[in-house]
């Protein structure tokens, strides 16, 4: 049903859903801080533009009585319950910031007449792609998939002279929310990744993964997994690994690889790490210090969500346009705005674009080094290190199928 929005006469409210079930187990206080930081910046920007308006946030808390798993498994109905609460209280703002679980976002989008924009820190799954009034401020699975296909096909770099068309995917069901949906997208038989690969098998047991490492009859040399180095070590330990094996470790929201004194452990030598460029996100800032790497990006996405709303509000007010319209609800896409760390670009479907970075471990220095970068906005790979000091033979990535000659 239509809910009146607190969104006119110089007073603009943001509804922030503070859900017990969240993509990341982040204390709500940290998210409140991020929202309040963003609000203060937005107020300054609007005032500077000569717009004498009030911008506030209303935090909507779930009672947590029914939906209390703390992760995304029981989030589907929690989002709808919160919307009902907002509806009953007639307290809908101009924009909804909050649902981070793919389940809850999908259901809320499906079951409501969305005449207002929804901004999500999360909602990584393919089921949240191409939603007209949804904006996602953390890299969704679709972006990862496009990188992987692009990289698999690449065969004209000094360090990658073979196209790949095969892969194993390790997915054991204990993944974090981001990893769950990233791997889910790779597993889905109808996804772009599956469509472009000739062979793909999902490994679900630790033993399956461990056996592949030295199996002479393996169908691919490439294994994709998601998590941090510790996760890989728990699985792989110090086991011997065939020299042609390449493990792609997806660890997007972890900028610890870029810290000055980090040394790559020996078990990472057969591994390429895919992460996000830290950009200006300064590792020693107090915004970051009390947060683990993933949560840092999560809180930052909330903050950037506030700045995005401020950006759109400013544009519409300067143009004398109404905020409570479908036009406003559909406007949060195909744009660049000034985020907390610098410019943030959203694609045609409201999904954040970013620079992904593929790292390798230098056998000389035992440091993580940038092999290449990938711009999700233009779907293009840019080599960085033309003569990497790889562990692989001839400092080239091997073919994905053992014994197969040049393609």
């Amino acid at each position: 049903s239509q809910v009146s929005q607190n969104c006119h006469n110089g007073s603009y409210e943001i509804s922030v859903l503070m859900m017990g079930n969240s993509a990341f187990a982040e204390p709500l206080k940290n998210l409140e801080d991020a929202v309040n930081e963003g609000l203060e910046i937005v107020r300054g920007r609007l005032q500077n533009a000569g717009l004498n308006v009030t911008v506030n946030a209303t935090f909507m808390y779930s009672d947590g009585l029914i939906h209390n798993s703390g992760d995304c498994r029981s989030s589907t109905c929690e989002g709808l319950d919160l919307l009902r609460k907002i509806s009953n209280a007639q307290r809908m703002g101009c924009v909804l910031i909050g649902p981070s679980c793919t389940y809850s976002t999908f259901q809320m989008y499906l079951d409501t007449e969305l005449s207002y924009p929804m901004i999500s820190a999360g909602s990584f799954g393919l089921s949240c792609d191409y939603k007209e009034t949804l904006t996602r401020l953390m890299s969704p699975a679709r972006k990862l998939m496009y990188f992987l296909v692009n990289f698999w096909k690449t065969n004209d770099l000094p360090f990658k002279t073979y196209s790949w068309s095969t892969s194993y995917v390790y997915k054991n069901g204990t993944e974090t929310e981001d990893c769950f949906w990233y791997l889910n997208a790779l597993e889905a038989s109808v996804s772009y990744f599956s469509h472009e690969l000739g062979f793909k098998v999902v490994l679900r047991q630790d033993k399956e993964f461990q056996d592949i490492l030295m199996d002479h009859n393996r169908k691919s040399n490439v294994i994709i997994m998601c998590g941090g180095p510790e996760f890989l070590y728990k699985l792989k330990g110090d086991r011997a690994v065939a020299e042609d094996i390449v493990i792609i470790l997806v660890d997007l929201f972890n900028d610890q690889y870029f810290e000055d004194n980090v040394t790559a452990p020996d078990y990472m030598k057969n591994v390429l790490v895919l992460t996000l460029s830290p950009g200006n996100s300064l590792l020693n800032s107090s915004f970051s210090r009390n947060l683990s790497p993933t949560k840092r990006d999560f809180a930052l996405a909330y903050l950037n969500g506030i700045l995005l709303f401020g950006h759109m509000l400013k544009i519409f007010l300067e143009n004398g346009e109404n905020i409570t319209t479908p036009k406003f609800a559909h406007a949060f896409r195909n744009l660049t705005f000034e985020g907390y760390d610098g410019p943030v670009t959203l694609d045609d479907w409201g999904d954040v674009d970013s620079t992904m970075v593929l790292l390798y471990t230098s056998v000389d220095t035992k440091k993580y080094k940038v092999l290449l970068t990938y711009d999700t906005h233009v779907n293009k790979t840019y080599p960085v290190d033309m003569s990497p000091t790889f562990t692989w033979k001839n400092s080239k990535l091997p073919n994905d199928i053992t014994g197969r000659g040049p393609q």
């Epitope: 930081e37 300054g44 107090s286 907390y340």
Partner: nanobody, 124 residues
Framework: QVQLVESGGGLVQAGGSLRLSCTGS????????MGWFRQAPGKEREFVAA????????DFADAVKGRFTISRDNAKNTVYLQMNSLKPEDTAVYYC?????????????????WGQGTQVTVSS
């Protein structure tokens, strides 16, 4: 051109207090983190305190934690450094600086504009 002007320095006895102010011309002021640094004679310029663009996040050098506080008033384009329980080793020229982004940062190269400095002398 961005200008930062510090004020509030002076001579104070050990155990006393001072409040430094820094007013900036950059707009919108809330877009930028702000920091205070100090430089004692013959020493390197060192980080003292910083505050984020929105004023929610702060950071302090270990040497001043619990004694100094930092705050800002974005409507007045001003950042403040309240210094309590001053010690002779706090004697230095105090500089205000503007960060490149809204974040709290503590390294010199992360700041792009600097004030001229204000002298703080703590006598024993």
């Amino acid at each position: 051109q961005v200008q930062l002007v510090e004020s509030g320095g002076g001579l104070v006895q050990a155990g006393g207090s001072l409040r430094l102010s820094c007013t900036g011309s950059a707009r919108p002021f809330s877009n930028y983190g702000m920091g205070w640094f100090r430089q004692a004679p013959g020493k390197e310029r060192e980080f003292v305190a910083a505050i984020s663009g929105g004023g929610v996040y702060t950071d302090f050098a270990d040497a001043v934690k619990g004694r100094f506080t930092i705050s800002r008033d974005n409507a007045k384009n001003t950042v403040y450094l309240q210094m309590n329980s001053l010690k002779p080793e706090d004697t230095a020229v105090y500089y205000c600086a503007r960060a490149r982004t809204a974040r709290v940062v503590s390294r010199r190269h992360e700041y792009d504009y600097w004030g001229q400095g204000t002298q703080v002398t703590v006598s024993s």
